[in-house]
């Protein structure tokens, strides 16, 4: 059918709760493209009717909720004027019963998120919640071993649980819970997190190192397309978020209307002692207002910026 297969993504998911997957592959999805979702090589696209339990919401596929029988390979087809790309997403739905006494104890969370806290440090856990704008998420509650977390050492900040002065007792089974509202209906999202404790600072200390950019300026012509990578090395067990910000706002939020500047999908390469992460920023069309503005790459507590600069006039052209 002339479509180029980009990659296959595997996702293992909890049943009986919402799930969403966004079909983005910068710079392909940055331009004028149409995105269509299909299930198991079906010729019939996933419904776009918002009342459907499984439906496409802009570039997302949304399950409200995910359940038994939804496992399978879903394809996202990205069509441009002269191109066609396809992303395969292999979804496996797992039955999950947090604290349901009829099962007898907690589930095996090996397939869920695994996060690490560093002993004696102030650290944090992250609740990964990725949903389209049509989904409104309520405040996040945190649980440890089925009990809601309370106490002075714990602070909930947006999607994170801040833990001060981490102790060995902080290891265990955590869950973050939020109520998601979509089209007037409410759903519970519950993510299990297996938390272990480490003493070692790991590769280059526990602070991520931004290899590139290096707080410098980049000469770029007005109106051109520009992609800049942020390369970060961090410990294999890190829980740091990596992102691009402008004016202290995520670029995807700052340019939410125009989508002219977007953050790319993070990739990483595993080395024996550390991981090398790459997350890019794409300027579809550089505008005058972009010059002189620091675009910040954040990785945990580390930051580095680029500033766009107009090239010096080339007098040889005259």
């Amino acid at each position: 059918d002339g479509c180029k297969d980009i990659f296959m993504k595997n996702e293992i998911l909890s049943a009986s709760q919402p799930f969403a997957f966004n079909c983005t592959f910068p710079p392909i999805t940055s331009g004028e493209v149409s995105v269509t979702w299909y299930k198991n090589s079906s010729k019939i696209p996933v419904s776009k009717i918002i009342q459907s339990r499984i439906h496409q919401d802009e570039t997302w596929i949304l399950f409200l909720p995910m359940e038994w029988g939804d496992s399978g390979v879903y394809q996202c087809v990205i069509k441009g004027r002269d191109s066609c790309h396809r992303i395969h997403v292999n979804l496996t739905v797992f039955e999950k019963h947090w604290c349901d006494t009829s099962i007898g104890g907690l589930p095996n969370l090996s397939d869920e998120y695994k996060q690490i806290l560093h002993l004696g440090k102030d650290d944090s856990l992250t609740c990964h919640l990725h949903f389209p704008k049509s989904c409104v998420l309520g405040p996040i509650k945190w649980y440890k071993d089925c009990n809601e977390i309370k106490g002075e050492r714990f602070t909930v900040l947006e999607t994170r649980l801040l833990v001060s002065n981490v102790s060995a007792e902080d290891r265990g089974n955590y869950a973050c819970q939020a109520i998601l509202t979509h089209s007037g209906k409410q759903y519970e999202v519950l993510n299990g997190i297996t938390v272990s404790i480490t003493e070692r600072a790991g590769y280059g200390g526990s602070v991520p190192k931004i290899i590139y950019p290096k707080n410098h300026s980049i000469e770029v012509q007005l109106g051109t397309t520009l992609i800049v990578d942020c390369n970060v090395t961090d410990t294999k067990d890190n829980t740091n978020l990596r992102c691009w910000r402008v004016n202290n706002t995520l670029v995807d939020d700052y340019y939410d209307e125009s989508k002219r500047i977007r953050e790319g999908v993070e990739t990483h390469v595993s080395f024996r002692e550390h991981n090398l992460y790459t997350v890019n920023i794409t300027f579809l069309e550089v505008k005058m207002e972009d010059y002189g503005l620091p675009f910040m790459c954040h990785a945990g507590v580390s930051t580095a910026y680029i500033i766009l600069q107009l090239p010096a006039p080339d007098f040889r052209a005259y």
Partner: antibody, heavy 122, light 107 residues
Framework: EVQLLESGGGLVQPGGSLRLSCAAS????????MSWVRQAPGKGLEWVSA????????YYADSVKGRFTISRDNSKNTLYLQMNSLRAEDTAVYYC???????????????WGQGTLVTVSS | DIQMTQSPSSLSASVGDRVTITCRAS??????LNWYQQKPGKAPKLLIY???SLQSGVPSRFSGSGSGTDFTLTISSLQPEDFATYYC?????????FGGGTKVEIK
């Protein structure tokens, strides 16, 4: 304690209809897939139908497709089997069962009700 | 649809005997095979799921093996309460199907 209690069985004429119910207790019903299995007198087990947690996915044996409808009401903790155009060969004890799939693929019925007898005869 | 063939359809054995029941699928079902026990007038009871995982509360004398198309249920030392009918079931794809059953009787 997990309990499944079927009801609604009885004697019905060929071509008639019947609705079976299965009342569930002792577990969070809305988080489990459910199924119906039947057993004709003196015969083996035959899988009839299954339904996902919120009812979004339903499955049927070829022998009942188009005639039987599985459904559930999570607010009432109840599973249903609407049986239309009944035939003599549908005569059986009908069991409801809780379906598990902790490994993602493959599933099994870990709790069963005691069954309700459906007799189709003129 | 996947057909499940069980053998033997019946067998006679004594207490303490080692009993083996086989189940064959018409196509590969990976490890998506379960075994159930049923006594007269009672509902079936889950013994083994996923070929070899013992359901909670089931005695360790029951074991399962196999993969693909050929599977075995073994009772290492038959006990009086084990005289019943045993069914295999595939859960690889719907419609899920049962084997015809194996009746284990007292010799």
């Amino acid at each position: 304690e997990v309990q499944l209690l079927e009801s609604g069985g009885g004697l019905v004429q060929p071509g008639g209809s019947l609705r079976l119910s299965c009342a569930a207790s002792g577990f969070i019903f809305s988080r489990y897939a459910m199924s119906w299995v039947r057993q004709a007198p003196g015969k083996g087990l035959e899988w009839v139908s299954a339904i996902s947690e919120s009812g979004g996915n339903t499955y049927y044996a070829d022998s009942v497709k188009g005639r039987f409808t599985i459904s559930r009401d999570n607010s009432k903790n109840t599973l249903y089997l609407q049986m239309n155009s009944l035939r003599a060969e549908d005569t059986a004890v009908y069991y409801c069962a809780r379906q598990r799939y902790p490994g993602g693929s493959g599933s099994y019925a870990d709790y069963w009700g005691q069954g309700t007898l459906v007799t189709v005869s003129s | 649809d996947i057909q499940m063939t069980q053998s033997p359809s019946s067998l006679s054995a004594s207490v303490g005997d080692r009993v083996t029941i086989t189940c064959r699928a018409s196509q590969s079902i990976s490890t998506d095979l379960n075994w159930y026990q049923q006594k007269p007038g009672k509902a079936p009871k889950l013994l083994i799921y996923g070929v070899s995982s013992l359901q909670s509360g089931v005695p360790s004398r029951f074991s399962g093996s196999g993969s693909g198309t050929d599977f075995t249920l073994t009772i290492s030392s038959l006990q009086p309460e084990d005289f019943a009918t045993y069914y295999c079931q595939q859960s690889h794809s719907t419609p899920f199907t049962f084997g015809g059953g194996t009746k284990v009787e007292i010799k």
